[in-house]
């Protein structure tokens, strides 16, 4: 605690500081999302969103943020993703986003309002001042896990998983030694917050790293572990090998081609 106190005084943390123009970026993204990307959310008041976002971390110790702090923001940014249209991902962020860029009716967390606002941003405040800290913010490993960014993603990831229904897809990286990583946000938060009364199937897409690789990565021990966790929660598990991520790139360039329209 004394170390935190000293660090908070001089505001020197192990991670990068708040993203430049953070308040402006949040407002700009909010307006773009609610007015252009998803006009059915045009009722959302972006100033209120920013106030709630700010209220979650400003004047609070950046190592003592709780999920409760983000509840007002979650309430304002509440959004319903249609059944069968939730795409989770783990270490495949770029591919997952290329997919939803084309398949516009499918949503990753970052395709929802709150995920879109915060994607790739860093933020934190300072204890007992109304300042945003642009110099440094707590690093999850070096400093503390209850920092504004980590708690935000844990909170919205939990909510995203809880609200999913029907068939849920997860895109996993077949190039990693642990295809399913229990320590990832997917493995530690989302998997455990899928609701069996709403979600009947979790289908994993294991992305191979190129053509010519004919292995069945759905047989990987970590996938078997995921299957066990999911099955114990009374959710049906299925897994598919996806051998052609190269096609993502082609379709990202020419999304209007009918070969880029796919039912999932």
């Amino acid at each position: 605690v004394s170390r935190w106190h000293q660090q908070s005084q001089r505001s020197q943390w192990g991670g990068r500081g708040t993203t430049d123009r953070f308040p402006e970026i949040i407002l700009e993204r909010c307006v773009e999302y609610t007015q252009t990307l998803l006009p059915e959310m045009r009722h959302v008041d972006c100033q209120n969103i920013w106030d709630a976002f700010k209220g979650a971390f400003i004047s609070k110790h950046p190592c003592k943020i709780t999920e409760e702090d983000y509840q007002p923001l979650l309430k304002l940014g509440n959004q319903t993703v249609p059944c069968n249209k939730t795409l989770l991902w783990s270490r495949t962020k770029h591919l997952a986003h290329q997919y939803t860029e084309i398949q516009r009716d499918v949503f990753t967390l970052e395709d929802t309002l709150l995920g879109y606002l915060a994607d790739d941003l860093t933020w934190c405040g300072e204890f007992e001042t109304s300042e945003i800290n642009y110099r440094s913010c707590p690093d999850w490993r070096k400093d503390c896990s209850s920092n504004p960014v980590s708690v935000f993603w844990k909170t919205v990831s939990r909510r995203f998983a809880e609200s999913a229904c029907g068939v849920v897809h997860v895109m996993l990286n077949g190039s990693c030694s642990n295809i399913f990583d229990k320590k990832s946000t997917f493995g530690s938060v989302e998997v455990h917050n899928l609701q069996p009364e709403k979600v009947h199937t979790l289908e994993a897409w294991v992305m191979h790293d190129g053509r010519g690789d004919s292995r069945d990565l759905c047989q990987d021990p970590s996938i078997k572990e995921l299957e066990l966790i999911i099955s114990k929660r009374n959710i049906t598990f299925s897994c598919k090998n996806i051998y052609r991520p190269d096609k993502f790139l082609q379709c990202a360039k020419t999304p209007e081609d009918s070969s880029c329209i796919s039912k999932i």
Partner: antibody, heavy 121, light 105 residues
Framework: QVQLVESGGGLVQPGGSLRLSCAAS????????MNWVRQAPGKGLEWVSG????????YYADSVKGRFTISRDNSKNTLYLQMNSLRAEDTAVYYC??????????????WGQGTLVTVSS | DIELTQPPSVSVAPGQTARISCSGD??????VSWYQQKPGQAPVLVIY???NRPSGIPERFSGSNSGNTATLTISGTQAEDEADYYC????????FGGGTKVEIK
């Protein structure tokens, strides 16, 4: 509507060569990967070769690797299969097929009517 | 490469249900497509991505895939459904099953 028309088949002696063509129309040819699939008389379907939309990547079944070459001319909306060192077991109807299925799964939504290649002395 | 095995033939009475199996080691881990081929004609896609029907294919055609078996089901079989049927998957290369002749008794 999508049309694929193969040509260039015929009778050829073992060890000989043949060049098949597939003229495509009714879709943006340069946006699609294309493939050749063959069917020996009274037998099942066998994938032979594939080529990416811009021709930068080519793929072959082990049975034809080193003997067949797939290519395309997007300005002419035409797919080719150059077949060298032909063997009796290459005798088949050769179909040109458009690869569909976006990025999650791969299948052939459109096929030509096929051209017969007979390798015999 | 995955090997896909189909029964050589399936016989069914008109109006009855025909089920064509396509077995392979953990085939449920791969997407499967099905083609119909009538004598002297090119194959026609009837099911893709396990269970999706292209436009123009009658609703009586359906597909499923799990474990070691993918299945094409033709409900209320009609005379025009008499044909050869091939399953196909992809695991770095395209693989076809040997084909099943559906005969309407």
């Amino acid at each position: 509507q999508v049309q694929l028309v193969e040509s260039g088949g015929g009778l050829v002696q073992p060890g000989g060569s043949l060049r098949l063509s597939c003229a495509a129309s009714g879709f943006t040819f340069s946006s699609y990967a294309m493939n050749w699939v063959r069917q020996a008389p009274g037998k099942g379907l066998e994938w032979v070769s594939g080529i990416s939309s811009w021709g930068s990547s080519t793929y072959y079944a082990d049975s034809v690797k080193g003997r067949f070459t797939i290519s395309r001319d997007n300005s002419k909306n035409t797919l080719y299969l150059q077949m060298n060192s032909l063997r009796a077991e290459d005798t088949a109807v050769y179909y040109c097929a458009r690869e569909d299925g976006s990025y999650m799964t791969d299948y052939f939504a459109y096929w030509g009517q096929g051209t017969l290649v007979t390798v015999s002395s | 490469d995955i090997e896909l095995t189909q029964p050589p033939s399936v016989s069914v009475a008109p109006g009855q249900t025909a089920r064509i199996s396509c077995s392979g080691d953990n085939i449920g881990h791969y997407y499967v497509s099905w083609y119909q081929q009538k004598p002297g004609q090119a194959p026609v896609l009837v099911i893709y991505s396990d269970s999706n029907r292209p436009s123009g294919i009658p609703e009586r055609f359906s597909g499923s895939n799990s474990g070691n078996t993918a299945t094409l089901t033709i409900s209320g079989t009609q005379a025009e459904d008499e044909a050869d049927y091939y399953c196909q998957s992809y695991n770095g290369t395209y693989v076809f099953g040997g084909g099943t002749k559906v005969e309407i008794k």
